[in-house]
Amino acid sequence: MDSFNYTTPDYGHYDDKDTLDLNTPVDKTSNTLRVPDILALVIFAVVFLVGVLGNALVVWVTAFEAKRTINAIWFLNLAVADFLSCLALPILFTSIVQHHHWPFGGAACSILPSLILLNMYASILLLATISADRFLLVFKPIWCQNFRGAGLAWIACAVAWGLALLLTIPSFLYRVVREEYFPPKVLCGVDYSHDKRRERAVAIVRLVLGFLWPLLTLTICYTFILLRTWSRRATRSTKTLKVVVAVVASFFIFWLPYQVTGIMMSFLEPSSPTFLLLKKLDSLCVSFAYINCCINPIIYVVAGQGFQGRLRKSLPSLLRNVLTEESVVRESKSFTRSTVDTMAQKTQAV
C-alpha cells in the first residue's frame, strides 16, 4: 500500500470541471467523495496546520541547542523528518479532492507520496537511535560520560537518514503515472509490472523493518530501561524518557492500519471484496499514518504542561525545557557533561 493509489482507485469517471461543454462525458457515478476520503482530507488539513507550525517551532527551538545538547539533536532530526513530510500534504490533499487525479507529473508522483515512507523509516531509525542512547545512559553511564558527544549523535542521525533513503527507494522506483477513463484522468500509483512476488517482498520488508522488528526491539529496550528506572526509585525528572516512550508508542499506533492493510493487499486477490474494501480505505490509512507528522509537537507541549504544572511559560521556552534536558556539552572528544554530575544521579535522570 504505497501511499496513494496502491492500485487504481475505482472512483469512476467524472466530469472535466474546467469545460462547460454539453458534449463533455457525464459522470457515471457520483461526483461526491467517499466518506473515507472526506475523513482523510480532514486529517490531512489538521496534520498540515499542526505539523508545519509545530515542527517548525520544534526545529527553531532545538536548532539553537543542537550544538550543545544531544537530546536537541534527536528531536531536531525527528522534527525535520516530520516537517518534510508535511510539505507534501497540500499536493496529496489536492489529488484526493480531484478524485485522485494527479496533475503534478511523473517526478512528483515518485517523490511526494514516497515522503511519508521516508518519514516512517527516518522516524523509526531515529527513534531506535534515541532508544539506544537512553539504554546506554542507563546501563553504560561511564561509556556515555566518555564517548556520548554531539559529533557521534550527528553521525548516528546521518546513518539513520541514509538507511531511510535506501529503504524508500523501492517505493520511489515503482511509482508511475498513467491515464485512464473518459475524459482521461492521470493516476499516480505503484506498478510492479505483473510481479506479485516483488510486490509482496516490498510489503514484507516494509512491515518487518518499518514496524515489527522495531516494535520488538524497542519494547524490549524500554522494558529494561523502565525496570531499571523503577528499581532505582528515581526521584529526578524522567521527562525525556516519558516523552520518548510517548513518541515511540504513537509511532506504532498510527502506522498500524497502514501496515496491516498494506500486507493484506499484497496477498489478496485484487478482485476480492476485501481487497476492494481496503483499497477504498487506502487514503484514510495514509492520512492516519500522517498523524505521526504532527503528534510529536503535541506530545512535547502536553509533556511540558505536565512538567510545568500548568502552561505558565511561553511555547518556545516550554518546548526548550522538554527537548533540551541536558546542559552544556564540553568541547571535548572524550568527555561530555550531562545535566547531573554524579553517575547515580545521571542514571536516574533518564
Epitope: 469512476g12 458534449n23 491515464e179 473518459f182 475524459p183 482521461p184 492521470v186 500509483g189 510492479y192 505483473h194
Partner: antibody, heavy 118, light 111 residues
C-alpha cells in the same frame, strides 16, 4: 515482454453469442485497461469497449445492450462476450492494452477472425 | 458521440516524398484538466494488427521513426511523414479518446 493472445471460435451462427478470451502476459490487469476493437472486411476500425484497471467498464453506445467485458485477474484473462450476432458482425476482433499515457493502445492481440453464418 | 473525419481517404505517393494527412473531430479533444489533446495515430499494414505511432496528438511512441510527426490541437490534427519509405505504405487511422473512443475512417497510403 508484453503480449496479448486471443482465443475464440472462428465461426458463429446468427443470433448466437460470441465469446473471446484475451490472455495477457508481461503486465498486470490491475494496472492496465484492456480495449476491444473490431474491423469488418475492407472496413475501418471500430471501438467496442474497455475494461479499466479497477474493473469498471465503458462500452460503445451502439453495442451497450449486447456486449459485456469481464476479467479474471489471477489468470490474467479478459473475457469478451457479444450476444445476438448478425451477419454484419463478421469481423476481426482485437484486444489491445491501454498504454500508460494518452489512453492509447500500445500493444495489440493478433486478432480473432469471426464469421457469422449459418 | 464524437465523429472523426479523415482526409484524404487515399493518397498516392512516391518514396522520399513528404506526406500530410488530416483528421478533424466534431468537438474539441483538449482536456483542460490534463492540458493534453486526446488524439492518437495508428498505422495498419495488410494482415497485421494496428500499431501505435502518436499519442497526445504530437508525442511519438517509443520506437517510431522520427519521420512521423503529429501536430494540431482542439479539433484539427495532422500526421506528417517527412520522407515516405516503402515500409510506410499502410492505412493510417486517427482516434480520439477524450469521450469514449472513435476511429476515423482511415487514410490509405499507396504508391
Amino acid at each position: 515482454q508484453v503480449q496479448l493472445k486471443q482465443s475464440g471460435p472462428g465461426q458463429v451462427a446468427p443470433s448466437q453469442s460470441l465469446s473471446i478470451t484475451c490472455t495477457v502476459s508481461g503486465f498486470s490487469l490491475i494496472n492496465s485497461a484492456v480495449h476491444w476493437v473490431r474491423q469488418s472486411p475492407g472496413k475501418g476500425l471500430e471501438w467496442l469497449g474497455v475494461i479499466w484497471s479497477d474493473g469498471s467498464t465503458d462500452y460503445n453506445t451502439a453495442f451497450i445492450s449486447r456486449l459485456s467485458i469481464s476479467r479474471d485477474n489471477s489468470k490474467s484473462q479478459v473475457f469478451f462476450k457479444m450476444r445476438s450476432l448478425q451477419v454484419d458482425d463478421t469481423a476481426v476482433y482485437y484486444c489491445a492494452r491501454n498504454g500508460r499515457l494518452g489512453n492509447a493502445m500500445d500493444y495489440w492481440g493478433q486478432g480473432t477472425s469471426v464469421t457469422v453464418s449459418s | 458521440d464524437i465523429v472523426m473525419t479523415q482526409s484524404p481517404s487515399s493518397l498516392a505517393v512516391s518514396v522520399g516524398e513528404k506526406v500530410t494527412m488530416s483528421c478533424k473531430s466534431s468537438q474539441s479533444l483538449f482536456s483542460s484538466r490534463t492540458r493534453k489533446n486526446y488524439l492518437a495515430w495508428y498505422q495498419q499494414k495488410p494482415g497485421q494488427s494496428p500499431k501505435l505511432l502518436i499519442y497526445w496528438a504530437s508525442t511519438r511512441e517509443s520506437g517510431v521513426p522520427y519521420r512521423f510527426t503529429g501536430s494540431g490541437s482542439g479539433t484539427d490534427f495532422t500526421l506528417t511523414i517527412s520522407s515516405v519509405q516503402t515500409e510506410d505504405l499502410a492505412v493510417y487511422y486517427c482516434k480520439q479518446s477524450y469521450n469514449l473512443l472513435t476511429f476515423g475512417a482511415g487514410t490509405k497510403l499507396e504508391l
